[in-house]
Interface confidence: medium
């Protein structure tokens, strides 16, 4: 099988409804990184839906990466993981949506979006270019897609997994909310 | 004159726990992020925490992560660092800094060395 | 092994110009973030020499540069001077994983006598 296939199997695979994912990152693919280390890590695995052992190689990578099984099982499945979702269901908000807006330590001061819970909408913020979290997104209509009820084409998921289908294309996995530039 | 000053650091048994202080002065202490760096003997410079200046955000590297409580009382303009199941790699002088600008840290204390060992 | 990497060693002759690397990757100096530079003198803390790629702290000579393209940093020192011999390391923002403030692993300048 080739890589498309199973990523047109993910999004459209009648059997097995879209996955209800806790965090975003549980879709990344597992990315041992450009260092030579030999380390056991865990990785949830979106096609079998369950947490897997893989060899991390000390560096980089992503945040598909956990020292035990039991923390990648306690971060990306729920007890109730494996029951069939319909698609009519509304999907969850991905929880960093409710983080609060954290600027982070440096002072880049760059524009930024975040999900305000309060007035459950997205909003602009002054991030500063270093630390901070997930709730911070590079333009209005992805946080509006991310976290926004009804946003995008249907919620959430479908948005993450249509990005993760293109940027899996184009050799990389999503970093949606990673993206903090320095725009000088 | 901008001066930070760290105590608390010693000899402790790995599983045990130290608590370090920094007292700064000089500055408007509240408006800085802080941070806690530190090196082992001999070794490079590895970021350990950082705190905002409200306190309200804190960070932490992987490897602190779930162990170490980066805190500040901004009355008494001091920065802490709960440091607990210490092990032999926490071995290492631990610099506070302040986060000045862009994401440099400004200005460092005299460090306080922290050897865990049995 | 650090996330930016640098030569462990140089040296150089007093007035001479010396370069000190620091490479990193996509994820942090590729990813448009800000490169610092630390000196270490002997048994004291570090002290910021530059900072936002480019900048220098007051009090810091002239003699000392920054710059940064794509993936790697440079600190340039000219006019080298005994009392430069120390450690020094680079410093950046990395945004992979859950994001860290990351260094080099630090050269040690030796100012030939």
């Known amino acids: 099988d080739s890589e498309e296939d199973e990523e047109h199997t993910i999004i459209t695979d009648t059997e097995l409804p879209p996955l209800k994912l806790m965090h975003s990152f549980c879709a990344f693919k597992a990315d041992d990184g450009p260092c030579k280390a030999i380390m056991k890590r865990f990785f949830f695995n979106i096609f079998t839906r369950q947490c897997e052992e893989f060899i991390y190689g000390g560096c980089e990578g992503n945040q598909n990466r956990f020292e035990s099984l039991e923390e990648c099982k306690k971060m990306c499945t729920r007890d109730n993981a494996n029951r069939i979702i319909k698609t009519t269901l509304q999907q969850e908000k991905p929880d960093f949506c409710f983080l609060e807006e954290d600027p982070g330590i440096c002072r880049g001061y760059i524009t930024r979006y975040f999900y305000n819970n309060q007035t459950k909408q997205c909003e602009r913020f002054k991030y500063g270019g270093c630390l901070g979290n997930m709730n911070n997104f590079e333009t209005l209509e992805e946080c509006k897609n991310i976290c926004e009820d009804g946003g995008g084409s249907g919620g959430g998921l479908n948005d993450i997994f249509e990005a993760q289908k293109i940027e899996w294309h184009e050799g990389g996995p999503p970093h949606h909310h990673h993206h903090h530039h320095h725009h000088h | 004159e901008v001066q930070l000053v760290e105590s608390g650091g010693g000899l402790v048994q790995p599983g045990g726990s130290l608590r370090l202080s920094c007292a700064a002065s000089?500055?408007?202490?509240?408006?800085?992020?802080m941070s806690w760096v530190r090196q082992a003997p001999g070794k490079g410079l590895e970021w350990v925490s950082a705190?905002?200046?409200?306190?309200?955000?804190?960070y932490y590297a992987d490897s602190v992560k779930g162990r170490f409580t980066i805190s500040r009382d901004n009355s008494k303009n001091t920065l802490y660092l709960q440091m607990n199941s210490l092990r032999a790699e926490d071995t290492a002088v631990y610099y506070c800094?302040?986060?000045?600008?862009?994401?440099?840290?400004?200005?460092w204390g005299q460090g306080t060395l922290v050897t865990v060992s049995s | 092994q650090s996330v930016l990497t640098q030569p462990p060693s140089l040296s150089g002759a007093p007035g001479q110009r010396v370069t000190i690397s620091c490479t990193g990757s996509s994820s942090n100096l590729g990813a448009d973030y800000d490169v610092q530079w630390y000196q270490q003198l002997p048994g004291t803390a570090p002290k910021l020499l530059i900072f936002?790629?480019?900048n220098r702290p007051s009090g810091v000579p002239d003699r000392f540069s920054g710059s940064r393209s794509g993936t790697s940093a440079s600190l340039a020192i000219t006019g080298l001077q005994a009392e430069d011999e120390a450690n020094y390391y680079c410093q950046s923002y990395d945004r992979s994983l859950s994001g860290s403030m990351v260094f080099g692993g630090g050269t040690k300048l030796t100012v030939l006598g």
């Open positions: 936002g790629n480019n």
């Open positions: 000089g500055f408007t202490f509240s408006s800085y992020a």
């Open positions: 705190i905002s200046g409200s306190g309200g955000s804190t």
């Open positions: 800094a302040n986060n000045g600008a862009a994401a440099a840290w400004d200005y």
